[in-house]
Interface confidence: medium
């Protein structure tokens, strides 16, 4: 008799793929545009990325550091009207893209939560949750919660409101903290909360340290669903050298949890390469005309247009990974087992029941390495075969689909491999 199939876990929409943050509408759209109507025109692009949710804003009225002139129920007229927002919501729903609204109150000010009047601000957030839930948003994000006094209890209350409305709604909290104990204390009282932090930004870009951080986090959080990013808002290029972007994309898409990206991460958008652009929100490079300030500063391979036409680009890799992440059971909700593969390497298996299994091997080092995969680290349920098929490499030149002998696996500097192999009883 065939073994009985393992029961599928409950899958919420944010479990099925990546979230895409657009914190600055104007920078995302560029050319002096930057409103909700314009964003609606970019939804097809988001669909092409196969992302499941758009984390938008903040877009509410906020006069810097002025509680009285901050209205979480009103859209700043610079971004558009409530009708524009409703229209965006309807269009996003038709394309199966969920909309999460950032309600961080004082986003233009010094302290995101104002330094005084915590209760007044918290009441404003409560009212806003109810208002926007009724308007049809799929969830909320609040950032910089380290600046919010009694954050845990407020988050618990807001989570209660959000989930009480419908269990299909999501609350995301963001913190600048990278301290695991602080992160765990926030998660402790809010089991369903999705928390973005700077935890992984401390990885030092080495395989051993990254492996240690990931496994510590997963062990500490147990079987709860988590998210993966390098910060609550910033671009990957703020933390990583260009040669590691592909590696991190592969890792973020294949770890167990929801990957969260900022606009531009898919093309390696880098503020440092665009003189005069703000580090936290550089202009999105749709094509070479997106940054007219310095002629010749932007080459085609830095832009969406240029990378869309190149199957070997970072954008093409992002699209492929996003597609795999959203349709393979082992990547959607599979078990995770990290194991030793040699210095500078981070490797792990994702597997679910009798479905196709995935092996990820990441070389963080700047030298080529032979991978010594220590299958003895793995439980019997996740044993390694002698060969696995190469699904993709982060570097060009490998023959995809070809079987690779795992005992003789060699990786190029900064190369990541995604291999697949069948379940064997």
């Amino acid at each position: 008799r065939a073994p009985r199939c393992r029961e599928l876990p409950a899958q919420k929409w944010w479990h099925t793929g990546a979230l895409y943050r657009i914190g600055d509408l104007q920078a995302f759209q560029g050319h002096g545009a930057g409103n909700l109507a314009g964003l609606k025109g970019r939804l097809d692009y988001l669909s092409s990325l196969k992302v499941k949710g758009l984390v938008l804003g903040p877009i509410h009225k906020n006069q810097k550091d002025d509680v009285a002139q901050t209205d979480l129920l009103q859209i700043d007229p610079n971004f558009g009207s409530k009708e524009d927002f409703d229209s965006l919501l309807q269009s996003a729903k038709k394309k199966s893209i969920r909309v999460i609204l950032d309600l961080t109150p004082n986003y233009r000010g010094e302290n995101s939560w104002f330094s005084t009047q915590v209760d007044t601000v918290a009441t404003k957030v409560k009212d806003a949750l109810e208002f926007w839930l009724q308007a049809g948003v799929d969830g909320f994000q609040v950032r910089d919660i380290e600046n919010l006094k009694d954050a845990s209890s407020f988050l618990a209350e807001w989570q209660n409101i959000t989930k009480g409305f419908s269990e299909d709604r999501l609350l995301i909290a963001g913190t600048n903290s990278s301290d695991l104990q602080q992160i765990l204390s926030l998660l402790e009282s809010n089991k369903d909360l999705l928390l973005t932090s700077s935890y992984l930004s401390d990885s030092g870009s080495t395989g051993e340290h990254t492996k240690s951080l990931v496994t510590q986090y997963l062990n500490a959080t147990g079987n709860r669903w988590c998210s993966w990013s390098l910060s609550q808002a910033r671009l990957l290029t703020s933390f990583l050298p260009a040669q590691l972007l592909r590696l991190y994309q592969l890792m973020l898409f294949t770890l167990p949890g929801t990957p969260v990206f900022s606009y531009g991460d898919e093309i390696g958008l880098d503020a440092a390469a665009l003189p005069g652009q703000p580090m936290e929100a550089p202009v999105m490079l749709w094509d070479e005309s997106s940054f007219p300030d310095i002629p010749g500063a932007v080459s085609a391979n830095m832009t969406v247009k240029g990378q869309s036409e190149d199957p070997g680009s970072l954008l093409s890799l992002f699209r492929r990974l996003s597609d795999q992440r959203s349709k393979e059971r082992s990547l959607l909700h599979g078990d995770f087992h990290a194991f030793s593969a040699g210095p500078g390497l981070f490797s792990y298996i994702r597997h679910w029941d009798q479905n196709e299994r995935f092996l990820v091997v990441l070389n963080f080092g700047d030298v080529g390495l032979s991978a010594g995969l220590q299958a003895s680290d793995l439980p019997a349920s996740a044993s390694l075969p002698a060969k696995a098929d190469l699904l993709l490499s982060t570097q060009p030149g490998r023959e995809e689909g070809s079987p690779l002998e795992l005992e003789r696996l060699k990786l190029e500097p900064h190369e990541g491999l995604l291999l697949r192999f069948p379940y064997a009883a």
């Epitope: 009212d127 109810e130 208002f131 269990e167």
Partner: antibody
């Protein structure tokens, strides 16, 4: 302990308005979501709508604008009004409070009040 | 709205017998919730988040399923289990219920 108690007339004439009160003890209606649900003679349950902690409301579209839910926070009571009733509205009406949060589910129900619509 | 279809509508089981009640959703839901109602009483929360038993529910009850297909199982029927069981979704408004399964003791 949270308790909900429905009250109101048990007989309403067709085309008139059905009005019910839900009195809440052990919890404040300024927290959470407070629902009305009805059960028809054939045992079918129908969700009618809620009034939330902030006073905002949601109504089931199937009730085609005939329903209104209001509250009086000073009395810790909330109310149901159903206009233009027909015999099809004969049912047991329940007020209910649900809490879904993390790994918690509480559903507090009143004992229900049978309302018959008849001439 | 999400339509929940329960089956069977009515069934009877002898003491000790295994009972399974099914609930099918018209579109995918994250979790299913189950209520028990006995004549003259209000519905009681019985199983939540698909498989977690509410306080005081005997361990012979279990829940399972995912997507659009869910079920409630009683491993060994007892007299006190005779009741009507409803499935319910909290995925989206309006909240909806199955038509109920009336379980009788044979």
């Amino acid at each position: 302990e949270v308790q909900l108690q429905e009250s109101g007339p048990s007989l309403v004439k067709p085309s008139q308005t059905l009005s019910l009160t839900c009195s809440v003890t052990g919890d404040s209606i300024t927290s959470g979501y407070w629902n009305w649900i009805r059960k028809f003679p054939g045992n079918k349950l129908e969700y009618m709508g809620y009034i939330s902690y902030s006073g905002s409301t949601y109504y089931n579209p199937s009730l085609k604008g005939r329903v209104s839910i209001t509250r009086d926070t000073s009395k810790n009571q909330y109310y149901l009004q159903l206009n233009s009733v027909t015999t099809e509205d004969t049912a047991t009406y329940y007020c209910q409070r649900h809490v879904i949060y993390d790994y918690t589910w509480f559903a507090y129900w009143g004992q229900g009040t049978l309302v018959t619509v008849s001439a | 709205q999400i339509v929940l279809t329960q089956s069977p509508a009515i069934m009877s089981a002898s003491p000790g017998e295994k009972v399974t009640i099914s609930c099918s959703a018209s579109s995918s839901v994250g979790y299913m919730y189950w209520l028990q109602q006995k004549p003259g009483s209000s519905p009681k929360p019985w199983i939540y988040r698909t498989s977690i038993l509410a306080s005081g529910v005997p361990a012979r009850f279990s829940g399972s399923g995912s997507g659009t297909s869910y079920s409630l199982t009683i491993s060994s029927m007892e007299a006190e289990d005779a009741a009507t069981y409803y499935c319910q979704q909290y995925q989206s408004y309006p909240l909806t219920f199955g038509a109920g399964t009336k379980l009788e003791l044979k």
